[in-house]
Amino acid sequence: APVRSLNCTLRDSQQKSLVMSGPYELKALHLQGQDMEQQVVFSMSFVQGEESNDKIPVALGLKEKNLYLSCVLKDDKPTLQLESVDPKNYPKKKMEKRFVFNKIEINNKLEFESAQFPNWYISTSQAENMPVFLGGTKGGQDITDFTMQFVSS
Protein backbone atom coordinates (compact mmCIF):
# COMPACT_ATOMS: atom_id res chain seq x y z
CA ALA A 1 0.00 0.00 0.00
CA PRO A 2 1.22 3.55 -0.67
CA VAL A 3 2.23 5.86 2.13
CA ARG A 4 -0.63 7.36 4.11
CA SER A 5 -0.67 11.15 4.48
CA LEU A 6 -2.95 13.14 6.78
CA ASN A 7 -3.48 16.88 6.94
CA CYS A 8 -2.65 18.77 10.12
CA THR A 9 -1.72 22.13 11.58
CA LEU A 10 0.87 22.78 14.30
CA ARG A 11 1.02 25.30 17.13
CA ASP A 12 3.96 25.76 19.44
CA SER A 13 3.56 25.58 23.21
CA GLN A 14 3.06 29.36 23.30
CA GLN A 15 0.11 28.90 20.89
CA LYS A 16 1.92 30.48 17.95
CA SER A 17 0.80 29.26 14.53
CA LEU A 18 3.05 28.60 11.55
CA VAL A 19 2.68 30.62 8.35
CA MET A 20 4.63 31.00 5.11
CA SER A 21 7.25 33.73 5.05
CA GLY A 22 8.39 33.96 1.46
CA PRO A 23 8.50 30.91 -0.81
CA TYR A 24 10.89 28.76 1.24
CA GLU A 25 10.52 29.78 4.89
CA LEU A 26 8.07 29.35 7.74
CA LYS A 27 7.61 31.77 10.60
CA ALA A 28 5.70 31.50 13.89
CA LEU A 29 3.27 34.10 15.17
CA HIS A 30 0.05 34.42 17.13
CA LEU A 31 -3.04 34.31 14.95
CA GLN A 32 -6.69 34.87 15.83
CA GLY A 33 -10.06 34.66 14.15
CA GLN A 34 -10.03 35.02 10.36
CA ASP A 35 -6.24 35.21 10.33
CA MET A 36 -6.11 31.54 11.35
CA GLU A 37 -6.75 30.76 7.69
CA GLN A 38 -3.18 31.91 6.98
CA GLN A 39 -1.68 29.02 8.94
CA VAL A 40 0.19 26.36 7.02
CA VAL A 41 -1.53 23.02 6.58
CA PHE A 42 0.94 20.17 6.54
CA SER A 43 0.51 16.85 4.82
CA MET A 44 2.08 14.50 7.34
CA SER A 45 3.17 11.17 5.87
CA PHE A 46 3.79 8.08 7.98
CA VAL A 47 7.10 6.90 6.59
CA GLN A 48 9.55 4.06 7.12
CA GLY A 49 11.84 4.31 10.14
CA GLU A 50 12.48 3.20 13.67
CA GLU A 51 9.22 3.33 15.61
CA SER A 52 8.01 2.98 19.19
CA ASN A 53 4.91 3.90 21.16
CA ASP A 54 6.18 7.43 21.74
CA LYS A 55 8.12 7.88 18.48
CA ILE A 56 6.67 7.76 14.96
CA PRO A 57 8.71 8.63 11.85
CA VAL A 58 6.98 11.19 9.65
CA ALA A 59 7.64 13.52 6.73
CA LEU A 60 6.14 17.01 6.76
CA GLY A 61 5.07 18.33 3.40
CA LEU A 62 3.05 21.44 2.70
CA LYS A 63 -0.47 20.53 1.63
CA GLU A 64 -0.89 20.57 -2.15
CA LYS A 65 2.64 21.92 -2.65
CA ASN A 66 5.72 19.96 -3.66
CA LEU A 67 7.62 21.31 -0.66
CA TYR A 68 8.91 19.27 2.29
CA LEU A 69 10.69 20.25 5.46
CA SER A 70 14.20 18.83 5.30
CA CYS A 71 17.34 18.92 7.43
CA VAL A 72 20.71 19.59 5.81
CA LEU A 73 24.14 20.85 6.82
CA LYS A 74 24.73 24.50 5.97
CA ASP A 75 28.06 25.96 7.01
CA ASP A 76 28.56 22.80 9.12
CA LYS A 77 25.35 23.42 11.06
CA PRO A 78 22.15 21.32 10.88
CA THR A 79 19.60 23.57 9.22
CA LEU A 80 15.87 23.36 8.52
CA GLN A 81 14.76 24.20 5.01
CA LEU A 82 11.80 23.84 2.69
CA GLU A 83 12.90 21.67 -0.20
CA SER A 84 11.17 21.35 -3.54
CA VAL A 85 10.59 17.78 -4.79
CA ASP A 86 9.19 16.06 -7.86
CA PRO A 87 5.48 15.54 -7.06
CA LYS A 88 5.45 12.38 -9.20
CA ASN A 89 7.80 10.68 -6.73
CA TYR A 90 6.69 12.12 -3.38
CA PRO A 91 5.51 11.32 -0.82
CA LYS A 92 6.86 7.79 -0.60
CA LYS A 93 7.22 5.20 2.13
CA LYS A 94 11.02 5.29 2.05
CA MET A 95 11.74 8.98 2.29
CA GLU A 96 15.35 10.15 2.27
CA LYS A 97 16.59 10.66 5.81
CA ARG A 98 16.81 14.44 5.52
CA PHE A 99 13.00 14.54 5.16
CA VAL A 100 12.29 12.29 8.16
CA PHE A 101 11.35 13.56 11.61
CA ASN A 102 10.71 11.48 14.69
CA LYS A 103 7.38 12.67 16.02
CA ILE A 104 7.84 12.20 19.75
CA GLU A 105 4.95 12.59 22.17
CA ILE A 106 5.53 12.42 25.91
CA ASN A 107 3.25 13.95 28.54
CA ASN A 108 1.22 16.27 26.34
CA LYS A 109 4.36 17.51 24.56
CA LEU A 110 4.98 16.87 20.89
CA GLU A 111 8.49 17.24 19.46
CA PHE A 112 9.85 16.75 15.97
CA GLU A 113 13.40 15.42 16.08
CA SER A 114 15.45 15.30 12.91
CA ALA A 115 16.23 11.68 11.96
CA GLN A 116 19.32 12.93 10.12
CA PHE A 117 20.57 14.93 13.11
CA PRO A 118 19.56 13.31 16.42
CA ASN A 119 18.82 15.76 19.24
CA TRP A 120 18.06 18.55 16.79
CA TYR A 121 14.43 19.66 16.81
CA ILE A 122 12.00 21.79 14.85
CA SER A 123 12.00 24.96 16.94
CA THR A 124 10.45 28.40 17.23
CA SER A 125 11.67 31.52 19.00
CA GLN A 126 9.93 33.15 21.95
CA ALA A 127 9.73 36.29 19.84
CA GLU A 128 6.91 36.89 17.39
CA ASN A 129 7.27 36.60 13.61
CA MET A 130 10.60 34.76 13.66
CA PRO A 131 11.59 31.88 11.36
CA VAL A 132 10.96 28.27 12.27
CA PHE A 133 14.36 26.61 12.56
CA LEU A 134 16.26 23.50 13.60
CA GLY A 135 17.51 23.85 17.16
CA GLY A 136 20.00 21.76 19.08
CA THR A 137 18.75 22.50 22.58
CA LYS A 138 15.65 21.43 24.49
CA GLY A 139 14.32 23.15 27.57
CA GLY A 140 16.08 26.43 26.87
CA GLN A 141 14.73 29.73 25.57
CA ASP A 142 13.67 28.31 22.22
CA ILE A 143 10.45 26.33 21.90
CA THR A 144 10.52 22.69 20.78
CA ASP A 145 7.07 21.61 22.01
CA PHE A 146 4.01 21.63 19.76
CA THR A 147 0.40 20.57 19.60
CA MET A 148 -1.10 19.07 16.45
CA GLN A 149 -4.58 19.54 15.06
CA PHE A 150 -5.51 17.00 12.41
CA VAL A 151 -7.90 18.36 9.78
CA SER A 152 -10.17 16.72 7.24
CA SER A 153 -8.80 16.35 3.72
Epitope: N53, E105, M148, V151
Partner: antibody, heavy 119, light 107 residues
Protein backbone atom coordinates in the same frame (compact mmCIF):
# COMPACT_ATOMS: atom_id res chain seq x y z
CA UNK B 1 -9.80 -7.34 31.92
CA UNK B 2 -9.55 -4.47 29.44
CA UNK B 3 -12.54 -2.22 29.99
CA UNK B 4 -13.97 1.20 29.10
CA UNK B 5 -16.99 2.60 30.95
CA UNK B 6 -18.76 5.74 29.76
CA UNK B 7 -20.92 8.05 31.87
CA UNK B 8 -22.50 11.48 31.71
CA UNK B 9 -25.12 10.95 29.02
CA UNK B 10 -28.67 12.20 29.40
CA UNK B 11 -31.41 14.43 28.02
CA UNK B 12 -30.47 18.01 27.22
CA UNK B 13 -32.10 20.90 25.40
CA UNK B 14 -30.74 22.22 22.08
CA UNK B 15 -27.99 24.78 22.59
CA UNK B 16 -27.01 23.40 26.00
CA UNK B 17 -23.88 21.47 27.02
CA UNK B 18 -23.01 18.02 28.27
CA UNK B 19 -19.75 16.45 29.43
CA UNK B 20 -19.14 12.75 28.91
CA UNK B 21 -16.53 10.73 30.78
CA UNK B 22 -14.89 7.41 30.05
CA UNK B 23 -13.04 5.47 32.72
CA UNK B 24 -10.50 2.87 31.62
CA UNK B 25 -9.02 -0.19 33.33
CA UNK B 26 -6.98 -3.24 32.42
CA UNK B 27 -4.46 -1.46 30.17
CA UNK B 28 -1.94 1.38 30.37
CA UNK B 29 -4.22 4.25 29.40
CA UNK B 30 -1.41 6.75 28.82
CA UNK B 31 0.05 4.60 26.04
CA UNK B 32 -3.04 4.64 23.83
CA UNK B 33 -4.74 7.11 21.52
CA UNK B 34 -8.44 7.41 22.31
CA UNK B 35 -11.61 8.39 20.44
CA UNK B 36 -15.31 8.99 20.73
CA UNK B 37 -17.62 7.35 18.18
CA UNK B 38 -21.37 7.96 18.11
CA UNK B 39 -24.36 6.11 16.73
CA UNK B 40 -27.63 7.90 15.98
CA UNK B 41 -30.79 5.85 16.71
CA UNK B 42 -31.09 3.05 14.15
CA UNK B 43 -28.15 4.44 12.19
CA UNK B 44 -24.49 3.71 11.52
CA UNK B 45 -21.29 4.77 13.26
CA UNK B 46 -19.62 8.20 13.14
CA UNK B 47 -16.18 9.05 14.56
CA UNK B 48 -16.53 12.39 16.33
CA UNK B 49 -13.32 13.07 18.27
CA UNK B 50 -9.76 11.83 18.72
CA UNK B 51 -6.92 12.56 21.13
CA UNK B 52 -3.38 11.22 21.00
CA UNK B 53 -1.93 9.23 23.89
CA UNK B 54 -0.24 12.22 25.50
CA UNK B 55 -2.99 14.67 24.60
CA UNK B 56 -0.95 16.81 22.18
CA UNK B 57 -2.85 15.75 19.06
CA UNK B 58 -6.57 16.08 18.36
CA UNK B 59 -9.05 15.66 15.52
CA UNK B 60 -12.70 16.56 14.98
CA UNK B 61 -14.74 16.05 11.81
CA UNK B 62 -16.50 19.10 10.41
CA UNK B 63 -19.87 18.01 11.90
CA UNK B 64 -18.68 18.76 15.45
CA UNK B 65 -15.63 20.99 14.99
CA UNK B 66 -15.80 24.07 17.22
CA UNK B 67 -18.55 22.55 19.39
CA UNK B 68 -16.94 19.41 20.84
CA UNK B 69 -13.71 19.23 22.83
CA UNK B 70 -11.91 16.01 23.70
CA UNK B 71 -9.49 15.83 26.61
CA UNK B 72 -7.90 13.26 28.88
CA UNK B 73 -6.46 12.91 32.36
CA UNK B 74 -3.81 10.21 32.18
CA UNK B 75 -3.25 10.33 35.93
CA UNK B 76 -6.87 9.26 36.41
CA UNK B 77 -7.15 6.97 33.34
CA UNK B 78 -10.09 9.02 32.13
CA UNK B 79 -11.22 10.41 28.78
CA UNK B 80 -13.67 13.31 28.40
CA UNK B 81 -15.89 14.80 25.72
CA UNK B 82 -17.20 18.31 26.29
CA UNK B 83 -20.19 18.89 24.01
CA UNK B 84 -21.39 22.47 23.61
CA UNK B 85 -24.10 24.07 21.46
CA UNK B 86 -25.82 20.70 21.16
CA UNK B 87 -28.20 20.04 18.28
CA UNK B 88 -30.97 17.46 17.82
CA UNK B 89 -28.75 15.67 15.27
CA UNK B 90 -26.20 15.03 18.03
CA UNK B 91 -28.65 12.55 19.58
CA UNK B 92 -27.30 9.02 19.83
CA UNK B 93 -25.25 6.57 21.81
CA UNK B 94 -21.70 7.80 22.42
CA UNK B 95 -18.98 5.18 22.64
CA UNK B 96 -15.51 5.66 24.05
CA UNK B 97 -13.05 3.64 21.95
CA UNK B 98 -9.35 2.86 22.07
CA UNK B 99 -7.52 3.82 18.90
CA UNK B 100 -7.57 6.60 16.38
CA UNK B 101 -5.59 8.42 13.75
CA UNK B 102 -2.35 6.46 13.56
CA UNK B 103 -3.40 2.82 13.79
CA UNK B 104 -6.71 3.61 12.16
CA UNK B 105 -8.78 1.05 14.02
CA UNK B 106 -10.77 0.99 17.27
CA UNK B 107 -9.95 -2.20 19.13
CA UNK B 108 -11.65 -1.70 22.52
CA UNK B 109 -15.07 -0.12 23.00
CA UNK B 110 -17.15 0.92 25.99
CA UNK B 111 -20.82 -0.01 26.38
CA UNK B 112 -21.93 3.47 25.32
CA UNK B 113 -23.82 6.31 27.00
CA UNK B 114 -27.03 7.71 25.45
CA UNK B 115 -27.38 11.39 24.65
CA UNK B 116 -30.73 12.90 23.69
CA UNK B 117 -30.96 16.50 22.48
CA UNK B 118 -34.57 17.58 22.52
CA UNK B 119 -36.70 20.51 23.60
CA UNK C 1 -14.85 12.63 2.18
CA UNK C 2 -14.49 9.03 1.09
CA UNK C 3 -17.86 7.27 1.14
CA UNK C 4 -18.11 3.60 2.03
CA UNK C 5 -21.04 1.70 0.53
CA UNK C 6 -21.89 -1.75 1.85
CA UNK C 7 -23.94 -4.36 0.05
CA UNK C 8 -26.29 -5.88 0.75
CA UNK C 9 -27.83 -3.72 3.46
CA UNK C 10 -29.37 -6.83 4.95
CA UNK C 11 -29.31 -10.56 4.29
CA UNK C 12 -30.62 -13.82 5.68
CA UNK C 13 -28.66 -17.06 5.70
CA UNK C 14 -28.70 -20.45 7.35
CA UNK C 15 -26.33 -21.88 9.93
CA UNK C 16 -23.33 -23.36 8.10
CA UNK C 17 -23.73 -21.09 5.06
CA UNK C 18 -20.89 -19.10 3.57
CA UNK C 19 -21.75 -15.41 3.85
CA UNK C 20 -20.14 -12.57 1.92
CA UNK C 21 -20.48 -8.81 2.47
CA UNK C 22 -18.97 -6.22 0.14
CA UNK C 23 -17.76 -2.72 0.90
CA UNK C 24 -16.99 -0.32 -1.93
CA UNK C 25 -15.00 2.87 -1.43
CA UNK C 26 -15.73 6.01 -3.44
CA UNK C 27 -11.97 6.36 -4.01
CA UNK C 28 -8.91 4.21 -3.64
CA UNK C 29 -8.19 3.41 0.01
CA UNK C 30 -5.28 0.99 -0.61
CA UNK C 31 -6.33 -1.74 1.88
CA UNK C 32 -6.59 0.77 4.74
CA UNK C 33 -9.84 -0.87 5.84
CA UNK C 34 -11.30 -2.46 8.97
CA UNK C 35 -14.38 -4.60 9.71
CA UNK C 36 -16.51 -4.53 12.87
CA UNK C 37 -19.33 -6.64 14.28
CA UNK C 38 -22.13 -5.13 16.36
CA UNK C 39 -24.49 -7.56 18.01
CA UNK C 40 -27.92 -6.20 19.08
CA UNK C 41 -27.72 -3.80 22.01
CA UNK C 42 -23.93 -4.08 22.27
CA UNK C 43 -20.90 -2.03 21.31
CA UNK C 44 -19.06 -2.71 18.05
CA UNK C 45 -16.18 -5.20 18.10
CA UNK C 46 -13.12 -5.08 15.84
CA UNK C 47 -12.88 -8.24 13.71
CA UNK C 48 -10.44 -7.43 10.91
CA UNK C 49 -7.93 -4.63 10.36
CA UNK C 50 -5.76 -3.72 7.37
CA UNK C 51 -8.35 -5.42 5.12
CA UNK C 52 -7.35 -8.98 5.99
CA UNK C 53 -5.66 -9.27 9.41
CA UNK C 54 -7.75 -10.98 12.08
CA UNK C 55 -7.95 -9.12 15.41
CA UNK C 56 -6.94 -10.97 18.57
CA UNK C 57 -9.34 -13.72 19.61
CA UNK C 58 -11.46 -13.56 16.45
CA UNK C 59 -12.48 -17.00 15.08
CA UNK C 60 -10.84 -18.10 11.84
CA UNK C 61 -14.22 -18.46 10.08
CA UNK C 62 -14.04 -14.68 9.57
CA UNK C 63 -11.83 -13.34 6.79
CA UNK C 64 -11.29 -10.28 4.65
CA UNK C 65 -9.91 -9.63 1.18
CA UNK C 66 -9.69 -6.84 -1.39
CA UNK C 67 -9.78 -6.22 -5.11
CA UNK C 68 -9.37 -2.66 -6.36
CA UNK C 69 -11.85 -0.47 -4.50
CA UNK C 70 -13.98 -3.48 -3.48
CA UNK C 71 -13.46 -5.12 -0.10
CA UNK C 72 -15.00 -8.41 0.88
CA UNK C 73 -15.83 -9.77 4.33
CA UNK C 74 -16.57 -13.48 4.54
CA UNK C 75 -17.93 -15.84 7.17
CA UNK C 76 -16.99 -19.33 5.95
CA UNK C 77 -19.56 -21.18 8.05
CA UNK C 78 -22.28 -19.10 9.69
CA UNK C 79 -22.88 -19.67 13.40
CA UNK C 80 -25.93 -18.57 15.45
CA UNK C 81 -23.79 -16.09 17.44
CA UNK C 82 -22.90 -14.30 14.20
CA UNK C 83 -26.31 -12.56 14.11
CA UNK C 84 -25.20 -8.93 14.04
CA UNK C 85 -24.70 -5.82 11.95
CA UNK C 86 -21.32 -5.62 10.22
CA UNK C 87 -19.55 -2.36 9.39
CA UNK C 88 -16.54 -1.53 7.27
CA UNK C 89 -14.40 1.53 8.02
CA UNK C 90 -11.58 3.09 6.01
CA UNK C 91 -8.56 4.95 7.40
CA UNK C 92 -6.88 6.27 4.29
CA UNK C 93 -7.79 9.96 4.63
CA UNK C 94 -9.49 12.06 7.31
CA UNK C 95 -12.28 11.75 8.16
CA UNK C 96 -12.22 7.98 8.59
CA UNK C 97 -15.76 6.88 7.75
CA UNK C 98 -17.87 3.78 8.26
CA UNK C 99 -20.15 1.99 5.86
CA UNK C 100 -23.88 2.11 6.58
CA UNK C 101 -23.86 -1.46 7.89
CA UNK C 102 -25.08 -4.86 6.78
CA UNK C 103 -27.65 -6.56 9.00
CA UNK C 104 -27.20 -10.33 9.05
CA UNK C 105 -30.07 -12.56 10.12
CA UNK C 106 -30.44 -16.31 10.33
CA UNK C 107 -33.24 -18.01 8.43
Amino acid sequence: EVQLVESGGGVVQPGRSLRLSCSSSGFIFSRYDMSWVRQAPGKGLEWVAYISHGGAGTYYPDTVKGRFTISRDNSKNTLFLQMDSLRPEDTGVYYCARGGVYKGYFDVWGQGTPVTVSS
Amino acid sequence: DIQMTQSPSSLSASVGDRVTITCRASGNIYTYLNWYQQTPGKAPKLLIYDAKTLADGVPSRFSGSSSGTDYTFTISSLQPEDIATYYCQHFWRLPYTFGQGTKLQIT
